[in-house]
Amino acid sequence: ARNGDRCPLGPGRCCRLHTVHASLEDLGWADWVLSPREVQVTMCIGACPSQFREANMHAQIKMNLHRLKPDTVPAPCCVPASYNPMVLIQKTDTGVSLQTYDDLLAKDCHCV
Amino acid sequence: ARNGDRCPLGPGRCCRLHTVHASLEDLGWADWVLSPREVQVTMCIGACPSQFREANMHAQIKMNLHRLKPDTVPAPCCVPASYNPMVLIQKTDTGVSLQTYDDLLAKDCHCV
């Protein structure tokens, strides 16, 4: 079996963590978040070739069926395996508050 | 906000559970699974337009950034939100065994 972390398409082409610099305006948050004004958003981007970072047996099945029926079954998709929490300072009725979000920033990625 | 379960692309076009009929040969399991010979594989297929079955805030972010930078950030992807278990009868060194797999069949779907 191919090494599950070796990308056969070339370096950086397969499913991995990327950082995208975004403003509150980019994120659509400007009306309810005060700070930070800019966020380093980590997200999962890249192709999911056979055996690459397969999350589970469902991903294996999906890849096998995709090879057989590419028009019906899509290839597995690069998604977060876990998340990093993030703090946002929000506007509230009474002023401002620090709020934790657990599902904003991808921590690592796999193919499902 | 659009109803998170109303598909704006038309019935059946958005992320949802599909059933694909597959043989052990299709799945690449013929050398280690005895039964069942054919499986109704449930998997998540379909588009993830804005606000449709968004799994979490990360999916919202991803969609907002996809609209801004479609060449850099892909749209959210339709993946299992949970799984149904499945029993396989496997070949073993000593004969056969019943084995439960918890991550084979998608139970429901969302966009991440």
Partner: antibody, heavy 119, light 107 residues
């Protein structure tokens, strides 16, 4: 590099006011908030409050409410902290510090401004 | 307000020693704890943020762990420049609060 440079030491009489400045450089001032933290001689760190450099929204420590005002001037990338009705127990080093960022980090601090309240 | 309790308040140690400082929050603060080092007459310096992330430029002998209410700062092998006072700080909610400090002194 990212820097916060504060105004010089002050000596004030009880009942007076003091205004400390904190000039930011090396980053986009409006992208972060500014905290003010003080430290009495030989004591620990006490958070005074926070101001969003972009909107001017504030959150003050309860015990200082009514006596403290934090402001920003985005044209000069400067934050200000004014403390009124000074008492001897306000004698402290006053620090400005950038943050919290997305990982709750208060990462860059000014060098501190010594404020002495004495009759 | 969330109270932060640091212990010990002081510790005497020698160069090369492993030093552990603990910080307890009066309620859960997720992983939103930072550790600072302060030397006399200087501003605090951020060492660790988000409980265990090492700030850029900080030597790897410093490490942080914990989540919820109990946190630890460890200096794996104390160096002469590490003699200072260390503070923990929570930024889970306003008001931001600091621990009382731990002075690391030369034995």
């Amino acid at each position: 590099q990212v820097q916060l440079v504060q105004s010089g030491a002050e000596v004030k009489k009880p009942g007076a006011s003091v205004k400390v400045s904190c000039k930011a450089s090396g980053y986009t001032f409006t992208s972060y908030g500014i905290n003010w933290v003080r430290q009495a001689p030989g004591q620990g760190l006490e958070w005074m409050g926070w101001i969003d450099a972009y909107s001017g929204s504030t959150n003050y420590a309860q015990k200082l409410q009514g006596r403290v005002t934090m402001t920003t001037d985005t044209s000069t990338s400067t934050a200000y902290m004014e403390l009124r009705s000074l008492r001897s127990d306000d004698t402290a080093v006053y620090y400005c510090a950038r943050g919290p960022g997305q990982y709750a980090d208060v990462d860059v601090w000014g060098q501190g401004t010594m404020v002495t309240v004495s009759s | 307000d969330i109270q932060m309790t640091q212990s010990p308040s002081s510790v005497s140690a020698s160069v090369g020693d492993r030093v552990t400082i603990t910080c307890r929050a009066s309620q859960g603060i997720s992983s939103w704890l930072a550790w600072y080092q302060q030397k006399p007459g200087k501003a605090p310096k951020l060492l660790i943020y988000a409980a265990s992330s090492l700030q850029s430029g900080v030597p790897s002998r410093f490490s942080g762990s914990g989540s919820g209410t109990d946190f630890t700062l460890t200096i794996s092998s104390l160096q002469p420049e590490d003699f200072a006072t260390y503070y923990c700080q929570q930024a889970n909610s306003f008001p931001i609060t600091f621990g009382g400090g731990t002075k690391v002194e030369i034995k």
